[in-house]
C-alpha cells in the first residue's frame, strides 16, 4: 500500500541465472535418398548461450548445414534467385538477401533450376522450416535458478530473493511455493498462459517480472519479490514476417586439412528477467 | 523400366574376398540411393550398406570396415567390395534402389517411399 510520508526510491539489481536439464533429441536428416536418424544427449553447455544484460536464451530447436567449406557453388534458388543465362548474374554482386558473392556465371542448381554461382560457404544453406514438433520439446522441463540481488542506496539496504532457508530442492509455484527461486519453464509458459510446445518450434521472447515492494520501517518491515511472467514478442506476426525468435552459429572443423563448419539455425526462447520496485521508508 | 542386375557372387573360403556389382538402368544414381540387403537362410532381410544419391555411404555395424559400397564413373554400376569374410556372411545379396533409414548401424528401407525396386539377387557362401 501507498504510504505518502514514506521516502520512496527505485531498486537497484543485479541477476545471475542457471538452468538445468537434459535432452535427449533424435533428429531426422533426409539426403539424398537416406534419412539418417541421429540420436544425441543435450545439456546445458549444448543448449544455453550467454546472453548480456538480464537475459537467458534456451535452445528448443534447430535446423542445421553440415559440412559447408568455403568454395564456389550455385546459390539457393529462393524465389526470385533463379537465372536463365550469366546475364543475370552480376560479378563481384552481393545480394543482401543471397549466402555469398556472385561470380557471374548462372549454373545448375539440380537437375530443373539454375542459379547464379557465389563465393560463398558450400553448400548454401537451404530454406528449410524448423522441424515440427521442436527437437528440443522436453526443455519445458528444464528448471532455472533465478539469483537475484538488491540494493537500495538510499535505505542503505541490501537483500536478495534467495533466503537462507529456502530449500534447493523447491520448484516455483504461484500458491504454494511463490517464493522459491528455481522455476520450471513450462510452468513459466503456463502461468503466462502461453504453449510451450507450440512456441518451441519457432522460438519466442518471454518475461519474467520480479516486482519489489518494499516497506523498509523496522516497525513493518516487508521486502520480498513478486513474480510474474508474460510473453513479450508479438505471437500474432504475420507468419511470413520472421516470426518467432532464431539466430545462426557455427561449430567449425577440419577435415583432410580443410576448414569446414557445420551452420547451426537455432530457434528458441529469450528469457527476459525485468526487475522493478521501490523502497520506501520513513 | 527400372532394373537391377547383380553379379559377382560365389564361393569363397573365410577371410577371402568378393566383389558384386549391381548394373543398373532406366533410372540414374542421382535419382535414388542404392544399397545392399542380405538375407540367408531362415533370417530376416537385413540391410548391408547404402551409397546416397549424393555419394555418401553407410554401413551397418556388422560389416563396418570390411565391406566397401562405390559407383563406377558413369554412376550406372554399383559395386559392393567385401573383404575378411566369415561364414555369418553368407546369404543371397541384393541390389536395391530407393529411399533407406540408417539408424545407428541399422540399415532398413524407408518404406514410406515406396518399396523400392530390387535386383534377382546374388548368392554369396562363406566356407569354413
Known amino acids: 500500500s501507498d504510504k505518502l510520508y514514506q521516502r520512496k526510491e527505485p531498486v537497484i539489481s543485479s541477476v545471475h541465472t542457471k538452468v538445468k536439464g537434459i535432452a535427449e533429441v533424435t533428429e531426422n536428416v533426409t539426403e539424398g535418398g537416406v534419412t539418417k536418424l541421429g540420436h544425441s544427449i543435450f545439456d546445458t553447455a549444448d543448449y544455453t548461450f550467454p546472453l548480456q544484460g538480464n537475459s537467458f536464451f534456451v535452445m528448443t530447436n534447430y535446423v542445421k548445414s553440415e559440412g559447408q567449406v568455403q568454395t564456389l557453388c550455385p546459390e539457393y534458388p529462393r524465389r526470385g534467385a533463379q537465372c536463365s543465362s550469366d546475364r543475370r548474374c552480376k560479378k563481384g554482386w552481393m545480394d543482401p538477401q543471397s549466402k555469398g558473392i556472385q561470380t557471374g556465371r548462372c549454373v545448375p542448381y539440380d537437375k530443373t533450376r539454375k542459379t547464379c554461382e557465389v563465393s560463398a560457404w558450400c553448400p548454401t544453406e537451404e530454406e528449410k522450416e524448423a522441424p515440427r514438433p521442436a527437437l528440443l520439446r522436453s526443455a519445458e522441463n528444464f528448471t532455472v535458478l533465478i539469483k537475484n540481488n538488491i540494493h537500495f542506496p538510499g535505505h542503505n539496504y541490501t537483500t536478495r530473493n534467495i533466503l537462507p532457508t529456502m530449500n534447493g530442492s523447491c520448484t516455483f509455484h504461484k500458491t504454494w511455493d511463490p517464493q522459491c527461486s528455481i522455476f520450471r519453464l513450462g510452468d513459466i509458459f503456463q502461468e503466462a498462459g502461453e504453449n510451450f510446445t507450440e512456441v518451441a518450434v519457432q522460438g519466442g521472447i518471454m518475461g519474467i517480472e520480479i516486482y519489489w515492494d518494499c516497506n523498509l520501517d523496522s516497525w513493518s518491515h516487508h521486502c520480498r519479490p513478486r513474480y510474474s511472467f508474460r510473453r513479450l514478442d508479438d505471437k500474432n506476426t504475420d507468419e511470413s514476417f520472421v516470426p518467432g525468435y532464431n539466430f545462426r552459429y557455427a561449430k567449425y572443423y577440419k577435415e583432410n586439412n580443410v576448414e569446414k563448419r557445420t551452420l547451426i539455425k537455432a530457434f528458441g526462447i529469450r528469457f527476459d528477467i525485468l526487475v522493478f520496485g521501490t523502497g520506501g521508508k520513513f | 523400366e527400372v532394373q537391377l542386375v547383380e553379379s559377382g557372387g560365389g564361393l569363397v573360403q573365410t577371410g577371402g574376398s568378393l566383389r558384386l556389382s549391381c548394373a543398373a538402368s532406366g533410372f540414374t544414381l542421382d535419382d535414388y540411393a542404392i544399397a545392399w540387403f542380405r538375407q540367408a537362410p531362415g533370417k530376416e532381410r537385413e540391410g548391408v550398406s547404402i551409397?546416397?544419391?549424393?555419394?555418401?555411404?553407410f554401413y551397418a555395424d556388422s560389416v563396418k570396415d570390411r565391406f566397401s559400397i562405390t559407383a563406377d564413373g558413369a554412376k550406372t554400376t554399383v559395386f559392393l567390395q567385401m573383404n575378411s569374410l566369415k561364414p555369418e556372411d553368407t546369404a543371397i545379396y541384393y541390389c536395391?534402389?530407393?529411399?533407406?533409414?540408417?539408424?545407428?548401424?541399422?540399415?532398413?528401407?524407408?518404406?514410406?517411399?515406396?518399396?523400392?525396386?530390387w535386383g534377382q539377387g546374388a548368392q554369396v557362401t562363406v566356407s569354413s
Open positions: 551409397l546416397s544419391s549424393i555419394g555418401k555411404t
Open positions: 536395391v534402389a530407393g529411399h533407406f533409414v540408417y539408424n545407428d548401424g541399422a540399415i532398413s528401407l524407408n518404406t514410406a517411399r515406396g518399396s523400392g525396386f
